[in-house]
């Protein structure tokens, strides 16, 4: 008949499993339960995947690994206390009197329940990495954490290479024994110990459970250290940078931590497993029963097969590891799970020209000299598209791409952003907003939804802010509907008249040149260069200013560059920026200074793109450590990451305007990095490429 083979990870667990099997058999519970001995949770997962065992209870981190690497699914969950159900919450606690926030944890003293523990280590460290606050080079999480905090107590870190920093705040027992032990010998061990570390002023932040503060304050704790503590003297750090009362843990936490769950192979019937265990818990979970499913006391251990604090087992409806873990915990695990043994020794960078090969070679040497990991290798390709193909084919690992190329890399080749460039505000030519500018006119005001029949001014055919984005956006929003992919005709029919300067006017609709004026002599009308006075962003704005058009599609800087005395040409000399407004996608109008909130799209910064199976945190970790050494254009370390002048080129490997590489944070897909408006505009245009 059918049998379920439970995997036990130790002798005591094997003992308890044997007793459970016997108890179930005597009670006539079907299918029969057998026990298989594994050496660890990891080993058991491998046995289950290999069909040599069927089930095991795992914690969140192990469920993530089992699901991601071996395709196992959670089918039965543990419940601990009725208030929170099948989860608890990992929180960061600080003294109310301090000024610490989630964004200022660098350099503060930290208290942890123990090394590799869920709320004390895995969640906070994973969250800090995943959110881009903590960069990790070469998977060396311990080093990254020891460099990040200004001293810590992480019980159990004494055996690591970074014990000086990670055990600095630990104090051992009253006689100084057991310093940094992962046991009650260390006074700052476990939930209450980590909180005590904060309460006694040793640390500035404690990573604990949602209930820890309330269980150890307001007279609820017996030990003398907690007698006088008041819960109101502590606050929680929220992910958005704010702080909250300790009772607000449902809204203000680092992650909801899923309960332990029973996992099985994808082809195993989860309902069957639950029926088996449900019969068992009905008979063997209350005091006085011959076998205790949720107690490990008889075996001299804790949490054997199930957590001792389990009050009941429940079926899991959506049997995927992602759904069970939840996005907060899932994200934290992504940041944490980096196996140095599985880290590729090289990061192969895609290069597109001889100068870029030279700069990449120098970068590889400079990084190696500083022992940065992984090492850089340089691999040539013929074009950005060729890079994408080679990355997808696993012949190369990374390349820096522009907005349109990021779109192609993501949509066609499945690549994802691993790091981004950030430019100084003065460098508006590298990343800018596309805006629709109109005259401030209360009597004839119209919105973005009412552009049909208006007169339009464009920098030129094919210009990003003057044509591609606005036309793409209007197509995507359904206002312009090209027939047979004829965008030009559709635009010419949508607007009453336009000026869209062009280099090759063959078969060009006349209405797209109707507003153009040419040069001072009236020649060169509608040409795609500065002989046409309405050419370019300045010209498109002039077209609006001189009342030729009703709307100008330009960059967010254009109005400022040509008003308030910033342009002394006669047509612009007396213009005031307050006489113009922006049309917003939501139908409103806004001041020209509100471009960040009221625009058609932002032309995004360049990003480093990689395969989705590449660990993006190791890529950013490498670039972040590298930019500390080589990011400043005046550094004396022998290489300049963001400068190409030594190679007689421009924008090699990275744009020269880059002031720093940034983590992608939540923008982990090409759509996230590019922004929905920019993607929509590109899709609007690409939908017309027949």
């Amino acid at each position: 008949g059918m049998e379920v083979r439970w995997c036990a990870t130790s002798d005591p667990e094997q003992h308890k499993c044997g007793n459970m099997s016997e108890a179930f058999r005597e009670a006539g519970i079907q299918p029969s339960l057998l026990c298989v001995r594994g050496t660890s949770a990891d080993h058991c997962v491998q046995l289950i995947a290999a069909q040599e065992a069927d089930a095991i209870t795992l914690d969140g981190g192990a469920i993530y690994e089992a699901g991601k690497e071996h395709g196992l699914k959670p089918v039965v969950g543990e419940v601990y206390d009725q208030e929170v159900g099948t989860s608890y919450y990992a929180v960061a606690v600080v003294r109310r009197s301090s000024h610490v926030t989630i964004d200022t944890l660098k350099g503060v003293k930290s208290c942890h329940t123990g090394i590799n523990r869920t709320v004390g280590w895995n969640v906070p460290v994973g969250y800090l990495v995943e959110s881009g606050r903590l960069s990790v080079m070469g998977c060396d999480v311990l080093k990254a954490v020891s460099d990040y905090f200004g001293g810590s107590c992480v019980p159990g870190a004494g055996e690591t290479s970074y014990s000086e920093s990670l055990c600095r705040l630990c104090r051992g027992d009253s006689s100084g024994e057991g310093v940094c032990d992962k046991s009650p010998l260390e006074r700052y061990y476990d939930y209450s110990g980590a909180f005590r570390c904060l309460a006694e002023g040793a640390g500035d932040v404690a990573f604990v459970k949602h209930s820890t503060v309330l269980e150890n304050t307001d007279g609820k704790t017996l030990p003398s250290w907690g007698q006088a503590l008041l819960s109101q003297d502590f606050e929680l750090l929220c992910r958005d940078g704010s702080r909250a009362d300790v009772t607000e843990w449902r809204q203000c936490h680092l992650a909801r931590v899923p309960a332990h769950a029973v996992v099985v192979r994808a082809d195993t019937d989860g309902g069957l497993i639950f029926r088996l265990l449900n019969e068992g818990q009905r008979l063997f979970s209350h005091e006085g029963s011959s076998f205790q499913m949720f107690s490990s006391e008889a075996y001299g251990q804790k949490d054997l097969l199930f957590k001792d604090s389990t009050s009941e087992l429940v079926p899991i409806a959506t049997q995927t590891y992602e759904a069970w873990l939840g996005h907060e915990y899932l994200h934290a695990m992504k940041g944490l799970l980096c196996d140095p043994n599985r880290l590729p020794p090289y990061l192969r960078w895609c290069v597109l020209s001889t100068p870029e090969i030279q700069k990449c070679g120098d970068m590889a040497v400079a990084f190696r000299r500083q022992r940065l990991k992984p090492e850089i290798q340089c691999v040539s390709a013929k074009s950005p598209q060729h890079c994408m193909e080679r990355i997808q084919a696993e012949q190369v690992d990374a390349v820096t791409l522009s907005g349109e190329d990021i779109y192609t890399a993501g949509k066609t080749y499945g690549l994802v952003p691993a790091a981004g460039e950030h430019y100084a505000p003065e460098d508006s030519s590298n990343s800018y907003y596309v805006v629709a500018v109109v005259r401030r006119d209360s009597s004839h005001a119209f919105t973005l939804d009412e552009l049909r029949g208006k007169r339009s001014c464009h920098a030129g055919f094919g210009s990003p802010a003057g044509w591609d984005v606005p036309v793409g956006a209007l197509i995507q929003r359904g206002f312009i509907r090209p027939k047979d992919c004829d965008v030009l005709t559709a635009v010419s029919e949508f607007f009453n008249a336009s000026c869209v300067p062009v280099n090759n006017p063959k078969n060009y609709p006349s209405s797209l040149c109707a507003l153009c004026v040419g040069d001072e002599q009236g020649r060169n009308k509608c040409v795609g260069n500065s002989q046409e006075r309405y050419y370019g962003y300045r010209g498109a704005f002039r077209c609006l200013v001189e009342n030729a058009g009703d709307v100008a599609f330009v960059r967010h800087t254009t109005v400022f560059d040509n008003t308030n005395g910033h342009n002394s040409e006669p047509w612009a000399a007396e213009l005031r920026s307050e006489d113009y407004e922006l049309l917003c996608p939501n139908g409103a109008r806004a001041e020209v200074s509100q471009f960040a909130a009221c625009n058609l799209a932002q032309i995004p910064p360049h990003a480093v793109m990689v395969r989705p199976d590449t660990n993006i945190f190791t890529v950013y970790g490498l670039l972040d450590k590298a930019q500390d050494l080589f990011g400043d254009d005046h550094n004396k370390n022998g290489f300049k990451m963001f400068d190409s002048s030594n190679y007689h080129g421009q924008d090699l490997l990275f744009k020269d305007a880059t002031v720093r590489a940034v983590p992608v944070g939540e923008k982990t897909t090409y759509r996230g990095w590019l922004g929905l408006d920019y993607v929509a505009a590109l899709e609007g245009m690409s939908s017309q490429q027949c």
């Epitope: 505000p425 003065e426 460098d427 508006s428 200074s593 960040a596 909130a597 254009d633 305007a657 940034v662």
Partner: antibody
């Protein structure tokens, strides 16, 4: 009218962390760039860094390893932390705004707060 | 690093007379967008700096028209057509074309 106001302790011990907050009124810190500058007694101005409208930070490389700038948009405040201070960090610390309207010149400044590093 | 050099460092001026301060950058301040991000600040005694001129020659709101700025590339000048008593203080040029933004060492204007 845009106003910026620095606040924080006037005395910090060597090796400790200097913490200052800039409270902004008359504008939102979710637009523009929000900066810290310092001026040692009797000396010139030194740029420390900024936090952008989207929350991205940039730090002067000479101070980068010790600086953190963060913000609390709900309070319209941004903060400076400078760790491991020495007597050389004694200065008047200013917060200031930069926007496109003045081509990212620092158009509005706080009144400054003197921070002395001494044991 | 990127250096801004002002001269003179001290400038005694008679009330009602003109004054001129020079500022030289160690590299061109013309940005790729064509703009020159060179600004001038005034710091009166005991006060915080105040923006006078931005982008070489644009007066900030509320700044008297006796102040003017000029220059291009690497050489820039701040002129005061007729010095008044309230103009006493230190004047700084500053660039933000290159990161980090840097300041000149300051020119102290005093009344003769």
């Amino acid at each position: 009218q845009v106003q910026l106001q620095e606040s924080g302790p006037g005395l910090v011990k060597p090796s400790e962390t200097l913490s200052l907050t800039c409270t902004v009124s008359g504008d939102s810190i979710t637009s523009g760039y929000w900066n810290w500058i310092r001026q040692p007694p009797g000396k010139g101005l030194e740029y420390i860094g900024y936090i952008s409208d989207s929350g991205i930070t940039y730090y002067n490389p000479s101070l980068k390893s010790r600086v953190t700038i963060s913000r609390d948009t709900s309070k319209n405040q941004y903060s400076l932390k400078l760790s491991s201070v020495t007597a050389a960090d004694t200065a008047v610390y200013y917060c200031a705004r930069r926007t496109l309207a003045t081509y990212y010149a620092m158009d509005y400044w706080g009144q400054g707060t003197l921070v002395t590093v001494s044991s | 690093d990127f250096v801004m050099t002002q001269s003179p460092l001290s400038l005694p001026v008679t009330l009602g007379q003109p004054a001129s301060i020079s500022c030289r950058a160690s590299q061109s301040l013309v940005q790729s967008d064509g703009n020159t991000y060179l600004h001038w600040y005034q710091q009166r005694p005991g006060q915080s700096p105040r923006l006078l001129i931005y982008r070489v020659s644009n007066r900030f709101s509320g700044v008297p028209d006796r102040f003017s700025g000029s220059g291009s590339g690497t050489d820039f000048t701040l002129k005061i057509s007729r010095v008044e008593a309230e103009d006493v203080g230190v004047y700084y040029c500053s660039q933000s074309t290159h990161v980090p933004p840097t300041f000149g060492q300051g020119t102290k204007l005093e009344i003769k």
